[in-house]
């Protein structure tokens, strides 16, 4: 499978909410011997590999924000902890997987990564990630609502496997 990032850039005004999205593409196994670990984190554009550094989003680590479930289950993060920070990550039956950030501030600007790990019981795993930029703007140049910029076809299948 691969991870697609439908949008590579989100430009939002301060105070707005935004939902960053990734999508699983390709065949997804749904047996008892496989589980999917999905999460979000902030990162930087590393010299060697984008998304290798896993920094917290509003003080919540990628482990706080993780979802895990079988192939076709929907899942949400634990509401209490995430919602206290204005965050919610969710996953549906169609491979879409998102994080919603409420009441954006300038400090939320940066590179965001979604990570999907397909974990099998016989000690194998397959990791893919997608990256997208969030720019939070203030003042007269800021848009009134979030503006999203589609990924190029090359970027939209932003794949890294381990």
């Amino acid at each position: 499978f691969k991870v697609a990032t439908p949008y590579s850039l989100y430009v939002c005004p301060e105070g707005q909410n935004v939902t960053l999205t990734c999508r699983l593409l390709g065949p997804v196994d749904k047996g008892h011997d496989v589980t999917f670990y999905k999460t979000w984190y902030r990162s930087s554009r590393g010299e060697v590999q984008t998304c290798s550094e896993r920094r917290p989003i509003r003080n919540l680590t990628f482990q706080d924000l993780h979802l895990h479930h079988g192939g076709h289950q929907a899942a949400n993060t634990s509401h209490d902890l995430a919602q206290r920070h204005g965050l919610e990550s969710a996953s549906d039956h169609h491979g879409n997987f998102s994080i919603t950030m409420r009441n954006l501030t300038l400090l939320d600007s940066g590179l965001y990564c979604c990570l999907v790990v397909e974990i099998r019981h016989h000690h194998s795993e397959h990791r893919v990630h997608g990256a997208m930029e969030l720019q939070v703007q203030t003042g007269k140049d800021a848009p009134s609502n979030c503006v999203v910029y589609p990924s190029s076809s090359q970027d939209s299948e932003n794949i890294t496997a381990a």
């Epitope: 011997d33 589980t35 670990y37 999460t39 590393g46 060697v48 590999q49 290798s52 550094e53 896993r54 990628f62 482990q63 993780h66 895990h68 990570l115 790990v117 974990i119 019981h121 016989h122 000690h123 194998s124 795993e125 990791r127 381990a162």
Partner: antibody, heavy 120, light 107 residues
Framework: QVQLVQSGAEVKKPGSSVKVSCKAS????????ISWVRQAPGQGLEWMGG????????NYAQKFQGRVTITADESTSTAYMELSSLRSEDTAVYYC?????????????WGQGTLVTVSS | DIQMTQSPSSLSASVGDRVTITCRAS??????LNWYQQKPGKAPKLLIY???SLQSGVPSRFSGSGSGTDFTLTISSLQPEDFATYYC?????????FGQGTKVEIK
């Protein structure tokens, strides 16, 4: 904050078995791999095997296959490592440690270690 | 199995020195390389993951670099609490394997 608390030191006779426990608190237990790593006196770190509780089945280093059994009890958030047919070379500190993601990623939380002494 | 080779096996240094430890993998592991610090009688502690990312709470004098087969852990200015043994670990494939360790001693 995640904590892994291991059972106390053991002294065992050659040929016997030992079972070490590792109780996790402060985080999700079921979906994270727990590995067991041992360290003989003055030596380096050696991976023995691991388990992801939701799967129930464990994976073992070839060297320990057939002699080690790793299990997990989701109801008590506890992982166990049992080593049989003990010999003097098994004298070591045994650590449990949690992987941040999947089977092979970094070990971000460690237990305090359990010293197992094998002596006649 | 992927073999991990660290060098040197031990080194003597003074407080304030810049210290470099290297780790070589027997095959390419991309950036799936982690570094740990262990003090006598204590469990190892994660310092660096994914070759160059600093684990939360670890002082910025520690840094990591490299990809493929060759990796480096650098302590920019050695502090008294840094005298310990350092291990690399590959996280690219099963089974996970560690380097043999590098002991950093006081000169």
């Amino acid at each position: 904050q995640v904590q892994l608390v291991q059972s106390g030191a053991e002294v065992k006779k050659p040929g016997s078995s030992v079972k070490v426990s590792c109780k996790a608190s402060g985080g999700t237990f079921s979906s994270y791999a727990i590995s067991w790593v041992r360290q003989a006196p003055g030596q380096g770190l050696e991976w023995m095997g691991g388990i992801i509780p939701i799967f129930g089945t464990a994976n073992y280093a070839q060297k320990f296959q057939g002699r080690v059994t790793i299990t997990a009890d989701e109801s008590t958030s506890t992982a166990y490592m049992e080593l049989s047919s003990l010999r003097s070379e098994d004298t070591a500190v045994y650590y449990c440690a949690r992987h941040s993601i999947g089977w092979v990623a970094e070990l971000d939380y460690w237990g305090q270690g359990t010293l197992v002494t094998v002596s006649s | 199995d992927i073999q991990m080779t660290q060098s040197p096996s031990s080194l003597s240094a003074s407080v304030g020195d810049r210290v470099t430890i290297t780790c070589r993998a027997s095959q390419s592991i991309n950036t799936d390389l982690n570094w740990y610090q262990q003090k006598p009688g204590k469990a190892p502690k994660l310092l660096i993951y994914a070759a160059s990312s600093l684990q939360s709470g670890v002082p910025s004098r520690f840094s990591g670099s490299g990809s493929g087969t060759d990796f480096t852990l650098t302590i920019s200015s050695l502090q008294p609490e840094d005298f310990a043994t350092y291990y690399c670990q590959q996280g690219a494939s099963d089974p996970i394997t560690f380097g043999q360790g590098t002991k950093v001693e006081i000169k």
